[in-house]
């Protein structure tokens, strides 16, 4: 029962995590204009992995996609790649884990096969979570570096009377969503790996055999041997769970900004 709960919880946590990674990847607020210690501007800038947006105080928002591939910073491309790899691995992990769930019966699938699939999906979730955390952290590091660089020369053209205010960017909501989502996926993966250990067949129970010695009424019953193979096939004692299959179809996609509102 504990194994089923651990596996189910691991699946749900990973599902929420991957939904969060997808949301973070699609979000436009990876970096937002730093408002602290800045003149009050009637324009608010924020940027995502795929496009940059400008929200005017008038209420109108304009978003522009990064239509170039070669002109983008290598770090941004790396972050995109990490997030996509995280999503792909997570999606495959989810698919595998659905079939690995103890509460779902598919044909005559062995417990050992389910254990293998649980471990596989667990590892996939761990890698997916790490990819997301790495992607978000790389972007955050890039922001910190740029922030201090732009702070160093906050005002350019100080020679004359004219000043140019440089827009500084700070952490956007997507970074926090990404960190939390990556962490959840990682935790879910660890839970799946723990569940895998419990799923592995532990006992091979042989039926007691009676040997009738002539003249004596002594029954010899050999004790059950502990199976140490871990993932060996256990065809004798299959347990059938008929718990309802839970489908989670509430994967949220982040509402996209409008090009012109």
């Amino acid at each position: 029962m504990a194994v089923t709960a651990c596996q189910g919880l691991g699946f749900v946590v990973s599902l929420i995590g991957i939904a969060g990674i997808i949301a973070a990847t699609c979000m436009d607020q990876w970096s937002t204009q730093d408002l602290y210690n800045n003149p009050v501007t009637a324009v608010f800038n924020y940027q995502g992995l795929w496009r940059s947006c400008v929200r005017e105080s008038s209420g109108f928002t304009e978003c522009r996609g990064y239509f170039t591939l070669l002109g983008l910073p290598a770090m941004l491309q790396a972050v995109r790649a990490l997030m996509i790899v995280g999503i792909v691995l997570g999606a495959i992990g989810l698919l595998v884990s659905i079939f690995a769930l103890k509460c779902i019966r598919i044909g005559s699938m062995e417990d050992s096969a389910k254990a293998n699939m649980t471990l596989t999906s667990g590892i996939m979730f761990i890698v997916s979570g790490l990819c997301a955390i790495a992607g978000v952290s790389v972007f955050a590091n890039m922001l910190v570096t740029n922030f201090w660089m732009s702070t160093a020369n906050m005002y350019t053209g100080m020679g004359g009377m004219v000043q140019t205010v440089q827009t500084r960017y700070t952490f956007g909501a997507a970074l926090f969503v990404g960190w939390v989502a990556g962490g959840l996926t990682l935790i879910g993966g660890v839970m799946m790996c723990i569940a895998c250990r419990g799923l592995a067949p532990e006992e091979t129970n042989y039926k007691a055999v009676s040997y009738h010695a002539s003249g004596h009424s002594v029954a010899y019953k050999p004790g059950g041997f502990k199976a140490s193979t871990g993932f060996g096939s256990n065809t004798k004692n299959k347990k059938i769970y008929d718990g309802g299959a839970r489908t989670e179809d509430e994967v949220q996609s982040y509402p996209s900004k409008h090009d012109y509102v």
């Epitope: 009050v40 800038n45 008038s58 209420g59 109108f60 004219v162 205010v165 827009t167």
Partner: antibody
Framework: DVQLVESGGGLVQPGGSRKLSCAAS????????MHWVRQAPEKGLEWVAY????????YYADTVKGRFTISRDNPKNTLFLQMTSLRSEDTAIYFC???????????WGQGTLVTVSA | DIVMTQSPSSLTVTTGEKVTMSCKSS????????????LTWYQQKPGQSPKLLIY???TRESGVPDRFTGSGSGTDFTLTISSVQTEDLAVYFC?????????FGAGTKLELK
């Protein structure tokens, strides 16, 4: 058709109060940022106050901060400017204007004259 | 506060003439996020409320004749009327739409010779 009509102007004594109204038609004031702009006789334009579509933030010109209050009544589709502690330098035609693309003011009212004099 | 300086303060013209007026801001009005300049031009005829002509420094408002052209970037902006008509005689104001308070220039008065 978008229309803005100001009212509430008139002669006020220094230190007195006045509430200006701006009735909007053709659009809902709650969906747009709105402004009050004034123009002293034979002078240039001076921005006075701004209220965003969500009623926050609200900004005021330093010359009126603490004395003027911008607000709106969404059901009545009306913008207000409550003016207190009026001074002679507040004498002007007060316009309400709608915020638009590029943070520009695309529609203006005809204006209402406020005269602060003893 | 951002100071908007318009020049000249008045212009005496004849119909059909090309007119250019300048507006300078004390800080750049260029937003790096969308590479747009938050400067607006308005026209105000005597006894009337101002009318929007150009926003984003160069985008003409719908219904505005194409003889009106806005140009410039950063801190220096220009409004050009390619061929002045009698109905263009008015005061032209530029406005900073990037920083609060949203300051206006003193205006350029267009008069007939």
């Amino acid at each position: 058709d978008v229309q803005l009509v100001e009212s509430g102007g008139g002669l006020v004594q220094p230190g007195g109060s006045r509430k200006l109204s701006c009735a909007a038609s053709g659009f809902t004031v709650s969906s747009f940022g709105m402004h009050w702009v004034r123009q002293a006789p034979e002078k240039g334009l001076e921005w006075v106050a701004y209220i965003s579509s969500g009623s926050s933030p609200i900004y005021y010109a330093d010359t009126v901060k603490g004395r003027f209050t911008i607000s709106r009544d969404n059901p009545k589709n009306t913008l207000f400017l409550q003016m207190t502690s009026l001074r002679s330098e507040d004498t002007a035609i007060y316009f309400c204007a709608r915020f638009y693309y590029g943070n520009s003011f695309d529609h203006w009212g005809q204006g209402t004259l406020v005269t602060v004099s003893a | 506060d951002i100071v908007m300086t318009q020049s000249p303060s008045s212009l005496t013209v004849t119909t059909g003439e090309k007119v250019t007026m300048s507006c300078k801001s004390s800080q750049s009005l260029l937003n790096s996020g969308n590479q747009k300049n938050y400067l607006t031009w308005y026209q105000q005829k005597p006894g009337q409320s101002p009318k929007l002509l150009i926003y984003w420094a160069s985008t003409r408002e719908s219904g505005v004749p194409d003889r009106f052209t806005g140009s410039g970037s950063g801190t220096d902006f220009t409004l050009t009327i390619s061929s002045v008509q009698t109905e263009d005689l008015a005061v032209y104001f530029c406005q900073n739409n990037y920083f609060f308070p949203l300051t206006f220039g003193a205006g350029t008065k267009l008069e007939l010779k």
